[in-house]
């Protein structure tokens, strides 16, 4: 999906008002210095591409993020503010949802959500030069 036509300011507002809090809740009990940020993004469409991938694509050691509250809210925000997103993405993530087993919070998942927090922070500051 091409995130170029999304309403970035509205997505940012949804992140600041609700998604960010759910990410913090998920990471509660974890030190902010525990994980290094290894995933980066260069602009807002790129950030949303990386956020979409890390949130909804199962990875080795963490196959269970799509049912988390922050993930459902991310999906809702993208569905509302990115025209055409639902048609191209929702059915695929719902198919994965059916295949997935029970929710397990592994260290790998915590690391992945830490990366997500970094991507969202970068999404919110698009004018900053890439480090």
């Amino acid at each position: 999906y091409d995130f170029t036509n999304c309403d970035f300011e509205k997505i940012k507002a949804a992140y600041l008002s609700t998604i960010s809090k759910d990410l913090i809740t998920y990471m509660s009990g974890t030190k902010s210095t525990e994980f290094n940020n290894t995933v980066s993004c260069s602009n807002r469409p790129h950030c949303l591409t990386e956020i979409q991938s890390l949130t909804f694509n199962p990875t080795a050691g963490c196959a269970s993020l799509a049912k988390e509250m922050f993930a459902m809210k991310t999906k809702a925000a993208l569905a509302i503010w990115c025209p055409g997103y639902s048609e191209t993405q929702i059915n695929a993530t719902q198919a994965m949802k059916k295949r997935r087993k029970r929710k397990v919070t592994t260290n790998k998942c915590l690391e992945q959500v830490s990366q997500l927090q970094g991507l969202w922070r970068r999404f919110n500051r698009p004018l900053l030069k890439q480090q």
């Epitope: 949804a14 459902m72 503010w81 025209p83």
Partner: antibody
Framework: QVQLVQSGAEVKKPGSSVKVSCKAS????????ISWVRQAPGQGLEWLGV????????IYAEKFQGRVTITADTSTSTAYMELSSLRSEDTAVYYC?????????????WGQGTLVTVSS | QSALTQPPSASGSPGQSVTISCTGT?????????VSWYQQHPGKAPKLMIY???KRPSGVPDRFSGSKSGNTASLTVSGLQAEDEADYYC???????????FGGGTKLTVL
């Protein structure tokens, strides 16, 4: 049973406000969109706005911006639509309608409608 | 803010096919595959018949079909039956600000 149940008919004076409720049951209220659509006597359907409780997002039709307020109480699975500065042209049946999960612009479940009459 | 344009009436005999058109712009029907159709009998709430241009919700007979070409969407009812007599409304997503437009409605009469 999956349904939307709306509050009863209202008679209001011009210039006043009306608040209509819509109680959802049988589905996870928060992750759907709840839209409000009205139909004046003998006229077509007119979309007023939508709320997606999951992310607390509301979007209003330009025509009603500033005059309509849509809210939701997830603890009771109830959505509300308040229309202010009522005039006679606002006399209509007001429907709440469920927008499909993540496809909020398709209304697959409707309330029974609430008749709002504006008359002096 | 303008509604989508539908003919006010359409008719056909039992067993025949009838097509109802719905014309918009590149900002709504032409820009997205997010067209839906609703059936409304007198005194009743509308019922979703078609969504995503041509998909039918479960329980809707396959006599109802939808299509789109450019800025115009169409609903075809084939094998007309008496119970198909109703008002039909098209609807289209119209962007993140406007969200939804309805057509003015078409009264379908089964002769």
């Amino acid at each position: 049973q999956v349904q939307l149940v709306q509050s009863g008919a209202e008679v209001k004076k011009p210039g006043s406000s009306v608040k209509v409720s819509c109680k959802a049951s049988g589905f996870t209220f928060g992750s759907y969109g709840i839209s409000w659509v009205r139909q004046a006597p003998g006229q077509g359907l007119e979309w007023l706005g939508v709320i997606v409780p999951l992310v607390d997002v509301t979007i209003y039709a330009e025509k009603f911006q500033g005059r309509v307020t849509i809210t939701a109480d997830t603890s009771t699975s109830t959505a509300y639509m308040e229309l202010s500065s009522l005039r006679s042209e606002d006399t209509a049946v007001y429907y709440c309608a469920r927008g499909q999960e993540y496809f909020y612009w398709y209304f697959d479940l409707w309330g029974q409608g609430t008749l709002v009459t504006v008359s002096s | 803010q303008s509604a989508l344009t539908q003919p006010p009436s359409a008719s056909g005999s039992p067993g025949q096919s009838v097509t109802i058109s719905c014309t918009g712009t590149i900002s709504d029907i032409g820009g997205y595959n997010r067209v839906s159709w609703y059936q409304q009998h007198p005194g009743k709430a509308p019922k979703l018949m078609i969504y995503e241009v041509s998909k039918r919700p479960s329980g809707v007979p396959d006599r109802f079909s939808g299509s789109k070409s450019g800025n115009t969407a169409s609903l075809t009812v084939s094998g007309l039956q008496a119970e198909d007599e109703a008002d039909y409304y098209c609807s289209s997503y119209a962007g993140t600000d406007t969200f939804v437009f309805f057509g003015g409605g078409t009264k379908l009469t089964v002769l």
